[in-house]
Structure formats: C-alpha cells, structure tokens
C-alpha cells in the first residue's frame, strides 16, 4: 500500500541497505524511491539530543515483508518509499537549504551574485550534483559570494553540517531546467575509452543508456552487444565519465555501441521505463518468487505489482502443461539490473513497469496514427483540447494542449477581451465538436496566466497557461504532450503536424472533426523574408509549404504544432498568426515553445 506521510520520532529497526546524507526527510524519501531496493527509510534530523555526526543521515532499508519494527526515537523521521504508490514521481528538488553545508568534492569555485545564479551554474554544469553558496553575510570576507559546485559518487552529499550564512541546494537537471545539450544518438561500432565508474548487465544499448541517465556519475556509456567477441563481456554496460564531460577517445570496434547520458532530455523521453520484452533471453538474479502465468505480458504485470520485483524471466508452458501456463520468475538484484544475461534458453525477459511512473506521462507511446487523409481518428492527438467560450453563446474559441494534469498550454491572443475565466470551458478527448452537448463533462478554468510581455500575436510572447479547476485523469484519449527539452534547441524536426478544428479556407466555418496536416518547418531566415513588415524573433518558429495549400487557419489558434522525435511527440509550437491561410510563401507563425520552457515550469511549479 502507498504510505506518503512521515512518521515523526520513529525509527525503523534493521533492514539497512546503505546510509546517505540528505538535507531533509522529504528528500530522503525521494532518494529511497529512486534506489533500486529501498522500501523504507529512517532520517535523523538535527537535534540537541542527537550526536551531530548523525544529523542528516538517511538510512535506506529493505524488508521482505515491506515493513519493519518501529522504535521511538527523538529526532528520527521514518517513512516509506513512493515505489508502493501509483502517482507520478519526480526527483526535482528546488528547495534551498539555509545554514547547511552539503559536503562533496568541490571541483569548481567562482563568484556568483546570488544562490539562484549558483544553482543555475550547477544545473548547467555536466558534473554538478549540488552546490553550497556563501552569502554576502558570510564571516570570511574572501569566501563571500563564492559558489562551490560539488559532485559525489552517489549524487548525494558525503556529509551535511551546520554552517552559518551559507545556503545549499541541488542541480535542477531533473527539473528539465538544464541548458546542456541533449544528445540522443547511439553510435554503432564505437567504444568510448574513458574511465569506468560502474558496470551493469543490460539487454540492449537503449537500456544501457537509460541506466547511465539515472546513474549520478555517468556521462556516457559503452555497451557490448551479445555478438561481442569476448564472451565474458557480452551484454556489459560500462558507465563512464571524464573530466571534460565528453569522451576523450572513440575507438572503432564492431559489435559495440556507445552513447550519452540523457539527463538533459529526461523530461521528454523515458529514462526509467524499460518496457520491451527480450525473447530467447534469460535474466539472472536473486529469485523473489516463481508464479504461474499465461503469458510474458502477464508475467510483467506480476512483476510490476510486486514492489520488490525488478525484472523477470518467463518460460512458456510445455504443450498442454499446467493449463497452458508458463513459469514466471520474479527477480531482483542489488542494483536493479540482472547479474547475468543468457541467450538461447527460450526464456522471455523484461523489467518491472513500476519505474515508468518516474518518467513523464507524456513519453507514453500513443496508438499508431492513420497516415494520409486530413481527418484525425480518436486518440490520435490525445493532448489536443478544444477551448470553448460561453459568451455570447457557447462555441469553439481556440485549441490547446494538455501539458500537465491541471495545465493547458495555449495562445495569449485567444483571450482578447476575456475578463474572467468563468466563461471558459476545456473539453478533452474530443474528436468531433458535435460530441459536445449540454451534459458533456468539461474542465472549468481556475486561472488564465498570460505571458507578462504579451501585447499582440505578431509581436511575440503569444503564450498562455490555463490552470484547470480539477485534474485530468490520463487515458488513451486524453494525455499530455512533452515539452521540448532546452537541450534540444538544435534538433531538426522533420515530422511535424498542425491540428485543430479551424477553418479549411479563409471564408469557412469551424470543422466538426479534428483536422491534421503535416507541415515542414521553415528556417527563421526564410520566414523573415516572407514577412518583411514583421520581426520574426527566435521566440517564434515557422512552418508551411512554399506553394501554400496546407496551414493553420481561424479556430486553430492556441493548438499544437506537434513534432515526433525519437518516437516521442513534442509540443514544438503553439499556433499563433499568419497572413491569411495557406497562402503561397506565407508560412504559419508559431510560438517557439522551447524558448518558454523556463516560464512554463516557473508558472506550473509555483507553490
């Protein structure tokens, strides 16, 4: 069961896996959740009754029964990991800890104007896990305003001490706020010859890359495939680092693959969820249980539902044996990866899907789309919403995109003259406008947040957030789209679609069925040539065919320009403005979402 509350003055006895240092019990709970085996924890807060060397210790614990005996102890705070919970989990920690010095390897020291600037520096430094900043009130003159960037093997401090007039905090890489490049490419026949910080077994290079991503010290990796000549190294995933943050040497070697940590892309691609099945593959590890199961899918479900299960191997039933049920071996290991991977034994293996909730919901694969045609099918664009106004009569006003369970991203110009959110209704999971009747459920709007710098669409900043009165329950027909990663600024998107219920020509009416059109992106230089009277800024992105013919039109405003990249859909643009509709050499102009990721996160993550 899911227990989220913390138990004050309580200590769990036994079951210790390891001890780390965290600045709060809340963060200890997050560390426990992300640890492959931790189910419970005990944190020691600062207290006069407690030995200062034990302050801020976070003891990670495991138990076969998923619980441990409780003992009363002042200053101890205990709790359970969120592994047992079904809700979305994030490692993002924006808290700043006053008068705490988080110890680690101080590898960079520089002057910063503020703790925020220091945190930004840490977030944009590939090695940085956390920082300590000496404020301008710090007693030692030469250390004032000094920003120390730190890293450790575990990503958590090696110790935490009280120190007046300093503040500490963590890198915000896990909050999608890093400007570091997001390099998704996997390089075949390549070995990165840098120092290994760890090695694990993995079934393929993609899993290896995802493991590297959530390993605190891993910056890049090399994976030896099952065809690698040296048998003892087959399926070996080497997690690597270097001082520069980049591989120093690349060696051409057949049957090896290399790539980079996806820490700067983690909010727009799955990094925890290993959802594939590996046929004719056996995962070895500590056996947790052996259960009868009808299929490998059923076995994966059993593993996902067993909180301690990390991976599984399913052996299909021998003809008519055991009511056609095979054996499902539920397994675990100290690091969450198989201790060995064997091939040719007929097993089907895979991983728990419990970790998928640590990934952004937007990375979930949606059903295959129908190619060709202009009318969409149900569930094809599950993030698309229709925004209605009830004044003077109810009608479709604009499109919008679900980006969170309480948030719609749309265009600011949709709210021309709108004084109150009370007249707005958001309908999700809609294909045809005719589905909307008086009794159709909708989301009321609690707040309209328009970008402070917005004046008119053509001047830019044409972006707005709608905070919904109630939360959206994600289903196949209504789910979020990923925001682009800031590290993806240089990605060239080639599979982009504009969707909406807008006019199909200049003098027309709102369409009943959601329309779609594949439209190529146009460079800003090219776009500027087509709009001499306007300033096309880097905060705008353009899309259209030179000959015209396909474009957004009236009623499409606020809707998404969705681009598929590495199997994940990203909200690249918001339909904003254009000269006419689908005119020759007049591309549509869209709000360039990647330039507003900070603004979006600031508004949606505000307390």
């Amino acid at each position: 069961e899911c227990v989220t509350q913390l138990l004050k003055d309580t200590c769990f006895e036994g079951g210790d896996i390891t001890t780390v240092f965290t600045p709060s019990a809340k963060y200890c709970q997050v560390v426990c959740t992300y640890h492959p085996r931790c189910l419970l924890f005990t944190f020691t807060a600062e207290s006069p009754s407690e030995d200062p060397t034990r302050w801020f210790t976070c003891v990670l614990k495991d138990s076969v029964t998923e619980t441990l005996p409780r003992v009363n102890r002042t200053a101890a705070i205990s709790g359970y990991s969120f592994k047992q919970c079904s809700h979305q989990i994030s490692a993002c920690n924006k808290d700043i800890y006053v008068d705490l010095d988080m110890k680690g390897i101080n590898y960079n020291s520089s002057v910063a104007k503020s703790a925020q600037e220091c945190q930004e520096r840490c977030t944009d430094d590939v090695h940085c896990h956390f920082f300590t900043y000496a404020t301008r009130q710090f007693p030692s003159l030469e250390h004032r305003n000094i920003c120390l960037l730190k890293h450790t093997q575990t990503g958590t401090p090696t110790r935490i001490t009280k120190l007046d007039k300093v503040v500490s905090g963590f890198s915000l890489k896990s909050c999608a706020l890093s400007n570091l490049a997001c390099i998704r490419d996997i390089f075949p026949n390549t070995v990165f010859a840098d120092s290994n910080i760890d090695s694990v077994m993995a079934p393929d290079a993609f899993v290896c890359g995802r493991i590297c991503t959530h390993h605190p010290g891993c910056l890049f990796f090399t994976f030896f495939s099952q065809e690698w000549p040296k048998e003892s190294q087959r399926n070996l995933c080497l997690l690597k680092t270097s001082e520069s943050g980049l591989p120093s040497t690349r060696i051409k070697k057949s049957k090896a693959l290399s790539g980079f940590s996806l820490q700067s892309c983690r909010h727009s691609i799955p990094v925890f969820c290993h959802s594939s099945f590996y046929h004719d593959t056996d995962f070895l590890g500590e056996e947790l249980d052996i259960v009868a199961a009808k299929s490998h899918e059923a076995c994966q479900k059993l593993c996902t539902n067993a909180v301690r299960c990390q991976f599984f191997t399913y052996t299909p039933a021998q003809a008519s044996c055991n009511e056609g049920k095979g054996k499902c071996y539920l397994k675990l290991s100290s690091n969450g990866s198989p201790t060995k991977i064997l091939h040719g034994r007929g097993g089907i293996s895979g991983y728990t899907l419990r970790l998928c909730k640590m990934d952004n919901e937007c990375t979930t694969k949606i059903k295959p789309r129908i190619v060709g045609g202009t009318a969409s099918v149900r569930g094809e664009w599950p993030w698309q919403v229709t925004l209605h106004t009830t004044s003077p009569t109810q009608r479709h006003l604009c499109g919008g995109s679900i980006i969170g369970n309480q948030w719609i991203l749309t265009a600011a110009h949709c709210f021309y003259g709108v004084e109150s959110p009370k007249i707005l209704r958001v309908y999700s999971g809609i294909l045809n406008q005719s589905e909307i009747k008086e009794d159709t459920s909708f989301f009321g709007v609690q707040e309209i947040i328009i970008h402070d710098q917005y004046k008119m669409a053509e001047s830019g900043y044409d972006i707005a957030l709608l905070k919904l009165e109630t939360t959206v329950n994600y289903t196949d027909s209504q789910r979020p789209i990923c925001l682009p990663s800031k590290g993806d600024r240089n990605v060239i998107y080639t599979d982009c679609w504009v969707t909406g219920w807008g006019y199909r020509k200049l003098r027309d009416k709102i369409q009943n069925t959601l329309q779609k059109a594949k439209i190529p992106l146009v460079t800003n230089e090219e776009c500027q040539k087509r709009y001499r009277g306007h300033k096309i800024t880097h905060k705008m992105i353009c899309a259209g065919y030179r000959e015209g013919g396909k474009d957004a039109c009236k009623g499409d405003s606020g809707g998404p320009l969705s681009c598929k990249h590495n199997e994940v859909w990203h909200l690249v643009g918001i339909t904003s403005w254009g000269e006419g509709c689908a005119q020759r050499e007049r591309p549509g102009v869209y709000t360039n979402v990647v330039e507003y990721v900070d603004w979006i996160l600031e508004k949606t993550q505000a307390v």
Epitope: P392, L397, C398, A411, A412, H413, C414, F415, Y416, G417, V418, E419, I450, D452, Q453, Y454, K455, M456, A457, E458, G502, L506, A552, C553, K554, G555, D556, S557, G558, T575, S576, W577, G578, G580, G588
Partner: antibody
Framework: QVTLKESGPGIVQPSQTLNLTCSFS??????????VSWIRQPSGKGLDWLAH???????RYNPSLMSRLTISKDTSRNQVFLMITSVDTADTATYYC??????????WGQGTLVTVSS | DIVLTQSPASLAVSLGQRATISCRAS??????????MNWFQQKPGQPPKLLIY???NLGSGVPARFSGSGSGTDFSLNIHPMEEDDTAMYFC?????????FGGGTKLELK
C-alpha cells in the same frame, strides 16, 4: 471603478505645442497588459487613433502623425501625457484618452475640446 | 494601414424594426482565432461606448438586441428591435494591427 479624465489648454495657437493630460483611477499602468491610448475626433467627423503607451513604457504611434507626437506616462501619479508639436487648425478636435488592456477600448474619458486658433 | 469602409453613411429605421450596418476592411482583420473587429456607439456630447468586441461578443452592460457578426473583411452590426435610445453614430474599429483604425461612421436615426 475605472474612470479617465482628459485636460488640456482649450485653445492653442498655430505652430505651438499642445500638451494634454489624462488622469485615471481604478487601474494601474504598472499592471502587465495595461495601456492607454489617445484618440481624437474633429467636430462632426470620425475618430482617429493617435498614440498608445503600454505598462512597460513601450509606445506606438500613428505613422501619419508620428513626427509630431510624444506619449509618456507617470505611473505613480496615474497620468498619461500627449504632446503634439507644430499644431495647425486641422488639429482642432475633441481629444479622448481610452484604456486598452488585452482587449478593446473598453473605457473612455469624457474628452477635452482643443481649438487651434490665433 | 487597414482602411475600414462603413455603409450606409446614414440609416433611418422604424421602432421595433432591424437596423443593419456594414463594415468592410481593406484586408483581413482575423488571425487564427479572433476577428479583431469592434463596434462603438456614440451619442452627441459623449465619448464612444463599446458595444461589440471581437466581431460578436457583447460589451459589458450592452443589451442583447445588439449583435455582431462576420469574419475576415466583412462585418455587420445588427440592432433588433430598434428602440428610440439607439439613435446615435456607430463606428467600427479594427484592433488587428497598428495603426488601429476606425470606420467613417454610420448615423442611425428613427424613421
């Protein structure tokens, strides 16, 4: 509630500079999205938009009069000003200030009549 | 500049009847969501009063006998049923781009 009130000299001589003041209450020009425009109307004729000032001191002018117009504001005193240089009889009109947020001109002042005459 | 042409220049309508005023723009005043066309009423010695914004939305406190329609370049204001109090000048105005411009006006009288 929102109110705006224009004030001006009443009569101004040709080639002189006309200074107008718009005093308002019920809103602040430091609020994001807020702006105030000047619009004029010669007697018995149509309306001409002249200039607009935004909360962030960004300004817009009617290109046909741009060289003669200067709009400014004093946010703390809730006032917007318009200066028109080198006036002539064609500038005789009722001058209105109007509030424009992220929408239309929803609130107008009563207007002030300005006559250009020697 | 976007030029707005109103027609007719003047109009006389009987009590209870329908009055229709047209406004044509020299180029589209639509963007991908909104028709940036507004309508104002002005009585002698008074400032203009907002009637309709974004082509069809009623201004605050405006009676429901006023309605607006249109998109792109062609717009109209309808008053039905005509009342004595509706005798005034009516102006259309575009908010699509600077310079914001007004139509020449239509004088509505009681027949």
């Amino acid at each position: 509630q929102v109110t705006l009130k224009e004030s001006g000299p009443g009569i101004v001589q040709p080639s002189q500079t006309l200074n107008l003041t718009c005093s308002f209450s019920g809103f602040s020009l430091s609020t994001s999205g807020m702006g105030v425009s000047w619009i004029r109307q010669p007697s018995g004729k149509g309306l001409d938009w002249l200039a607009h000032i935004y909360w962030d001191d960004d300004k817009r002018y009617n290109p046909s009069l741009m060289s003669r117009l200067t709009i400014s504001k004093d946010t703390s005193r809730n006032q917007v000003f318009l200066m028109i240089t080198s006036v002539d009889t064609a500038d005789t009109a009722t001058y209105y200030c109007a509030r424009k947020g992220r929408g239309p001109f929803a609130y107008w002042g009563q207007g002030t009549l300005v006559t250009v005459s020697s | 500049d976007i030029v707005l042409t109103q027609s007719p220049a003047s109009l006389a309508v009987s009590l209870g009847q329908r009055a229709t005023i047209s406004c044509r723009a020299s180029e589209s005043v639509d963007n991908y969501a909104i028709s940036f066309m507004n309508w104002f009423q002005q009585k002698p010695g008074q400032p203009p009063k907002l009637l309709i914004y974004a082509a069809s939305n009623l201004g605050s406190g405006v009676p429901a006998r006023f309605s607006g329609s249109g998109s792109g370049t062609d717009f109209s204001l309808n008053i039905h049923p005509m009342e004595e109090d509706d005798t005034a000048m009516y102006f259309c105005q575009q908010d699509k781009e600077v310079p914001w411009t007004f139509g020449g006006g239509t004088k509505l009288e009681l027949k």
